[in-house]
Interface confidence: medium
């Protein structure tokens, strides 16, 4: 068995979360991508995917998330803009694959947000907070529902019409039963 | 196997910038980070930031986030370190280095296996 | 920032002694830790990268072990080329952050 592995990433309140997922070039190019959270004792869950098939760097948004497939260099860029407290826990890239179950890319991603304030200097806040104004050409994408016994992912919105409006925006600010890492300073 | 050629030494005032690259040759470039690196004399080394060029989103470390700017070019593999407001004290030998990551992967990141040869930056008036 | 404490910051031995040098991370950095060797007028050197991994093409008198907080750079059987100083340093986390360094020389 593959043993789980995780990378930390400690970052303050309104900073970027901005990591890559790397797949096998020639078998998972055009598959569809998705990022999960992992919350102590449940199934992922699915809060972003990209379109199927996934189209070569177009960026999908949902929410404060946004996913761009580089088909050429075999990697998922993932974006969590805004960070909140509230995002702390463990998240992962899968792959999905139907009929099969999705195929997860390692390594798993622990992510730590802490207060900050206005001004606090971090890794990527002054310098980078204009990248990240959401580019006029994202679009949002469904995910499929997956029921298994290892994998259960959220069902897609009622309608495709909604997926434009406000509503349909994952919205993290929620999240309580998450496992959480001490930081110290 | 990958290569790194930096620019050549340079002498600045206090208070001016100076600009260094690093060009990549052999090898993939683009989704790789390219780290900065500093020794100052007799300190030790000091990381200053990194890029992914592909993602084109550097980070920076905290001491030097209001005065360094790194870039990176695709189309030229190379990568750009720029330091402004230039001060006695930033005298130093200035290394770009290669490493994995960072960001989920099956391979992580593998410490910064790659490096230029180092530019010697002097600041005196 | 995660700070990183190695110890000792300078070391004297002699050419065929077993030399260890450790570095504390200010919290848990999992197994994320290079060791660099660096020489006067040459750009440093990858040695040991997830901790305990040898880099290819460095000799196997070096090890590396450790993790979370506490890490060791071992040379089994030191070597003339081996004095230099040897630098830690941690991707946990952005900024990546070096140890201060522990300078090797001759006895």
């Known amino acids: 068995a593959t043993k789980l592995t995780e990378e930390k990433y400690e970052l303050k309140e309104g900073q970027t979360l901005d990591v890559k997922c790397d797949y096998t070039l020639e078998k998972f190019a055009s598959s569809q991508k998705a990022w999960q959270i992992i919350r102590d004792g449940e199934m992922p869950k699915t809060l972003a995917c990209t379109e199927r098939p996934s189209k070569n760097s177009h960026p999908v948004q949902v929410g404060r998330i946004i996913l761009e497939d580089y088909h050429d260099h075999g990697l998922l860029r993932v974006r969590m803009v805004n960070l909140q407290v509230e995002d702390s826990g463990l998240y992962q890239c899968v792959i999905y694959q139907p009929p099969k179950e999705p195929h997860m890319l390692f390594d798993r991603i622990r992510l730590v947000v802490t207060k900050g304030f206005s001004g606090t200097p971090g890794s990527n806040e002054n310098s980078t907070q204009n990248v990240y104004k959401i580019p006029p050409t994202t679009t949002k994408a469904l995910c499929p529902l997956y029921t298994s016994p290892r994998t259960v992912t959220q069902a897609p919105p009622k309608s495709t019409a909604d997926v434009s409006t406000p509503d349909s925006e994952i919205n993290l600010t929620n999240v309580t039963d998450i496992i959480r890492v001490p930081v110290f300073n | 196997q990958v290569q790194l050629v930096q620019s050549g030494a340079e002498v600045k005032r206090p208070g001016s910038s100076v600009k260094v690259s690093c060009k990549a040759s052999g090898g993939t470039f683009s989704i790789y980070v390219i780290s900065w690196v500093r020794q100052a004399p007799g300190q030790g080394l000091e990381w200053m930031g990194g890029i992914i060029p592909l993602f084109g989103t550097p980070n920076y470390a905290q001491q030097f986030q209001d005065r360094v700017t790194i870039t990176a070019d695709e189309s030229t593999r190379t990568a750009y370190m720029e330091l402004s407001s230039l001060r006695s004290e930033d005298t130093a030998v200035y290394y770009c280095?290669?490493?994995?990551?960072?960001?989920?992967?099956?391979?992580?990141?593998?410490?910064?296996?790659?490096w230029g040869q180092g530019t010697t930056v002097t600041v005196s008036s | 920032d995660i700070q990183m404490t190695q110890s000792p910051t300078s070391l004297s031995a002699s050419v065929g002694d077993r030399v260890t040098i450790t570095c504390r991370a200010s919290q848990g950095i999992s197994s994320w830790l290079a060791w660099y060797q660096h020489k006067p007028g040459k750009a440093p050197k990858l040695l040991i990268y997830?901790?305990?991994s040898l880099q290819s093409g460095v000799p196997s008198r070096f090890s590396g072990s450790g993790s979370g907080t506490d890490f060791t750079l071992t040379i089994s059987s030191l070597q003339p080329e081996d004095f230099a100083t040897y630098y830690c340093?941690?991707?946990?986390?952005?900024?990546?952050?070096f140890g201060q360094g522990t300078k090797l020389e001759i006895k």
């Open positions: 340093q941690q991707y946990n986390s952005y900024p990546y952050t």
């Open positions: 280095a290669r490493g994995h990551g960072p960001g989920s992967s099956h391979y992580s990141y593998y410490g910064l296996d790659v």
């Open positions: 997830a901790a305990s």
